[in-house]
Each structure stands twice: as structure tokens, then as C-alpha cells.
């Protein structure tokens, strides 16, 4: 349930999900890069 994040605004909720998605993509790329470099 929203990872413990509470927000009353639906658009803010969507923004939080977009940020989370972006971070997941960035961290995923970094992880893949580290594995590749090893």
C-alpha cells in the first residue's frame, strides 16, 4: 500500500510512482553495468 507513503493528492501519488519508476530504471541500469564490468 503505497510503500508507506501517504499523500492526499492523486496527482502527487502519480508523481511519486513516476519518480520510483525512474529510480528503479536508473538503479537497474547501474546494477547491470556493475555486473557487466565484473
Amino acid at each position: 500500500h503505497s510503500d508507506g507513503i501517504f499523500t492526499d493528492s492523486y496527482s502527487r501519488y502519480r508523481k511519486q510512482m513516476a519518480v520510483k519508476k525512474y529510480l528503479a530504471a536508473v538503479l537497474g541500469k547501474r546494477y547491470k553495468q556493475r555486473v557487466k564490468n565484473k
Epitope: 493528492s9 492523486y10 496527482s11 501519488y13 502519480r14 519508476k21
Partner: antibody, heavy 117, light 112 residues
Framework: EVQLVQSGAEVKKPGSSVKVSCKAS????????MHWVRQAPGQGLEWMGL????????RYAQKFQGRVTITADESTSTAYMELSSLRSEDTAVYYC??????????WGQGTLVTVSS | DIVMTQSPDSLAVSLGERATINCKSS???????????LNWLQQKPGQPPKRLIY???TRESGVPDRFSGSGSGTDFTLTISSLQAEDVAVYYC?????????FGGGTKVEIK
């Protein structure tokens, strides 16, 4: 264009649970905000909750908190809404709907759930 | 929760005449992102609702231009400039600014 196809009508006993499915096609399922809305016979519309499948992140209406569970299966592009401890007042048409621009742009055809002893 | 109050409950209008439906919210629907998430839906008997207007005044593609939405803050209006037979339906306003998302009670539009 996104299309939503829901499961068929259900008749349930009071106290039991119902699970309604909603299969999406024509869009990136994991990146959609999938909502559930219900409509009792001859009544208005009532928002129940949503799921963002990419993180399985849910948000429920206070009224249904603890009684509704929304899940999603990305492999089949299907969302599910389970409502427990059914009572006669839960007799309604249940709709799934997809958000676009902060509004429900696409709706399923509806699933009638009848709660009767 | 935000209370959405629609008026009138029902409306009988002659073909070709104007129909006006009002919607009032208990709190401003202007979001921090600058948008107003006030929507209008049309529902015909036995069918799911259909989006007509979003962001208070943006018409859904394919919706005839006789339908228009206006208003800001807490007061909104749906206008059908020249009622056609196919416009007979129930119209709902709803807000998508604040959780929990809430709907007005609906306005039934009929032909006089």
C-alpha cells in the same frame, strides 16, 4: 486504444467473497493506473481503489479498507478485485477503469455481483 | 472526503434547447500541478460510463462540440448547447484531485 474485458456475473452468499477480473489489451499494462468503481442498482458511482501494476502498489477507499484487495498479474495483463465479507448492500455492477490524464478514459463492460441468501 | 453535489437531479429539455448541469465540490479541485481534475461522464442505460470532459473543460476526442465544460475551484458546469435525442442519459461529475476519488449523485437528462 486500450480495451478492458471483465469476468462474468456472479451470485454470492452473504459473508462470502468475490473476485472479479479485468483483462487489458492495447496498452502497456504494468504502466497503467487501474481503478475499480462500483454502481449499486439504480444508484451512483463509488470509487473503491486502484493498483499500479509495475510496483503492485495499491490505494484503497477508506470505506472499503480491510475488505477489498486489488491485485494484478502482469504476465496476463489482468487486474483483480476481491471483496470479502459480502452483504446485500454489495450487490452492484463492478467496473474496472484506466486512468489517462488523471481521468477514467477507458472502462470495462461491468460485472454484476449479486449477494443473496 | 470531498463531497460532490450535482444539480438538478433530473432535467427535461426540448430537442434543440440548452441543458445545463451544475456540480459543486466541498473543496477546491485545483491541484498543485496547476490542473483541475474535474471530470464529466455520460452513462446510458445498461452501458458503462463514458468520459466526456476532463480537466474541467477539455473535451474527449470524438465527443460532439455541443458538449462543453466550464468552471474552476469549486463550481463547475456541463452544458449541452442543443440537446439531441442521443444525449438522453445520466451525467456524473467526479473529482480526481484528492483521495478518495468521489462522484456526484448524477443528473438524469430527458426529452421534454
Amino acid at each position: 486504444e486500450v480495451q478492458l474485458v471483465q469476468s462474468g456475473a456472479e451470485v454470492k452468499k452473504p459473508g462470502s467473497s468475490v473476485k472479479v477480473s479485468c483483462k487489458a489489451s492495447g496498452g502497456t499494462f504494468s504502466d497503467l493506473y487501474m481503478h475499480w468503481v462500483r454502481q449499486a442498482p439504480g444508484q451512483g458511482l463509488e470509487w473503491m481503489g486502484l493498483i499500479y501494476p509495475i510496483f503492485a502498489d495499491t490505494r484503497y477507499a477508506q470505506k472499503f479498507q480491510g475488505r477489498v484487495t486489488i491485485t494484478a498479474d502482469e504476465s496476463t495483463s489482468t487486474a483483480y478485485m476481491e471483496l470479502s465479507s459480502l452483504r446485500s448492500e454489495d450487490t452492484a455492477v463492478y467496473y474496472c477503469a484506466i486512468d489517462q490524464d488523471g481521468s477514467f478514459a477507458y472502462w470495462g463492460q461491468g460485472t454484476l455481483v449479486t449477494v443473496s441468501s | 472526503d470531498i463531497v460532490m453535489t450535482q444539480s438538478p437531479d433530473s432535467l427535461a429539455v426540448s430537442l434543440g434547447e440548452r441543458a445545463t448541469i451544475n456540480c459543486k465540490s466541498s473543496q477546491s479541485l485545483l491541484d498543485a500541478d496547476g490542473k483541475t481534475y474535474l471530470n464529466w461522464l455520460q452513462q446510458k442505460p445498461g452501458q458503462p460510463p463514458k468520459r466526456l470532459i476532463y480537466w474541467a473543460s477539455t473535451r474527449e476526442s470524438g465527443v460532439p462540440d455541443r458538449f462543453s465544460g466550464s468552471g474552476s475551484g469549486t463550481d463547475f458546469t456541463l452544458t449541452i448547447s442543443s440537446l439531441q435525442a442521443e444525449d438522453v442519459a445520466v451525467y456524473y461529475c467526479w473529482q480526481g484531485t484528492w483521495f478518495d476519488l468521489t462522484f456526484g449523485g448524477g443528473t438524469k437528462v430527458e426529452i421534454k
